[in-house]
Interface confidence: medium
């Protein structure tokens, strides 16, 4: 379990401010919703609504919140220790192997087929031979999850020092 | 909703160890800590060690060191508390916990008896 | 490893009282104090974190306070559901350790 964390993925370096809470780290180690100081001496929150960190963590930094693109609803928010969850708008998909838009589903199926499956955020329609019952070609498999982030966001441990 | 659920009472024979399981459903396991907190009889609460299953690291406290073992398997959202050499004293509830700091969800409780 | 000593080992107190539990650390802490609430046969629960900061859900009555060595945990009035054994626990350092409890009962 490893994530590559790119400079993107980084709030922008912030001082302590007053409302940010520090606790003293533990082996060197922060807690989820926390990141740590410069100096090694602190764990500092994360700003509700701005950034997050999801595990225990030597980041100097939490983790921006992703914002959902249009297109998009919003699942649940971003807060100190979860990412915000977006989800595609009704009508559109997630693909597998394009994760970074919505597509819109197909209206029907093509001629001599009937639909099996319903449109989802995370699959399109899904469409079968009438006779024989095999799957359309260009069926696009069911992701299991649905809960999406934006490219970079790790969804696995980060840890700076491995 | 975290769910920290842990295995049935035991009862044990001085100088044996005992084997405590605790499964999390219902969040991300790997991403806090798991501390096991004992409580004897009639007694406080005392933090015997943690293990932060990302990292796979355990620490300890003095007492127990030598004669506890946790350790996480990520793949069920298993943790497992090991004590050793038990004596009479080691009769106690042990409680896991999720742990960030402070412990906001604990376990149900084991009851380890240890008696000849 | 850090001593954390609670007094009074108990006490006795009405519905409707204020009751002021302390907790005394061997060396300075910092903020870095939890309290936690625990009733006979049930597991702890967590009341305050960080010296003073109230766990969702915890009613307003409990509040905390201090820094360094001394910590108090303040209940302004106390209600039924109230009595049981108050714990104070610090994270500064490994090992985390807990005070011996302080239980509050029915005057």
């Known amino acids: 379990e490893s994530a590559l964390i790119t400079q993107q993925d980084l709030a922008p370096q912030q001082r302590a401010a007053p409302q940010q809470k520090r606790s003293s780290p533990s082996e060197g180690l922060c807690p989820p919703g926390h990141h740590i100081s410069e100096d090694g001496r602190d764990c500092i929150s994360c700003k509700y609504g701005q950034d997050y960190s999801t595990h225990w963590n030597d980041l100097l930094f939490c983790l921006r919140c992703t914002r959902c693109d249009s297109g998009e609803v919003e699942l649940s928010p971003c807060t100190t220790t979860r990412n915000t969850v977006c989800q595609c708008e009704e009508g559109t998909f997630r693909e597998e192997d394009s994760p970074e838009m919505c597509r819109k589903c197909r209206t029907g199926c093509p001629r001599g087929m009937v639909k099996v499956g319903d449109c989802t955020p995370w699959s399109d329609i899904e469409c079968v031979h009438k006779e024989s019952g095999t799957k359309h070609s260009g069926e696009v498999p069911a992701v299991e999850e649905t809960v999406t982030s934006s490219p970079g966001t790790p969804a696995s441990p980060c840890s700076l020092s491995g | 909703q975290v769910q920290l659920v842990q295995s049935g009472a035991e009862v044990k024979k001085p100088g044996s160890s005992v084997k405590v399981s605790c499964k999390a459903s219902g969040g991300t396991f790997s991403s806090y800590a798991i501390s096991w907190v004992r409580q004897a009889p009639g007694q406080g609460l005392e933090w015997m060690g943690r293990i932060i299953p990302i990292f796979g690291t355990a620490n300890y406290a003095q007492k127990f060191q030598g004669r506890v073992t946790i350790t996480a398997d990520k793949s069920t959202s298993t943790a497992y508390m090991e004590l050793s050499s038990l004596r009479s004293e080691d009769t106690a509830v042990y409680y896991c916990a999720r742990e960030g700091f402070y412990i906001d969800y604990w376990g149900q409780g084991t009851t380890v008896t240890v008696s000849s | 490893d850090i001593q954390m000593t609670q007094s009074p080992s108990s006490l006795s107190a009405s519905v409707g009282d204020r009751v002021t539990i302390t907790c005394s650390a061997s060396?300075?802490?910092?903020?870095?104090l939890n309290w936690y609430q625990q009733k006979p046969g049930k597991a702890p629960k967590l009341l305050i974190y960080?010296?003073?900061s109230l766990h969702s859900g915890v009613p307003s009555r409990f509040s905390g306070s201090g820094s360094g060595t001394d910590f108090t945990l303040t209940i302004s009035s106390l209600q039924p559901e109230d009595f049981a054994t108050y714990y104070c626990q610090q994270y500064s350092k490994l090992p985390w350790t807990f005070g011996q409890g302080t239980k509050v009962e029915i005057k």
């Open positions: 060396q300075g802490i910092r903020n870095y």
């Open positions: 960080y010296t003073s």
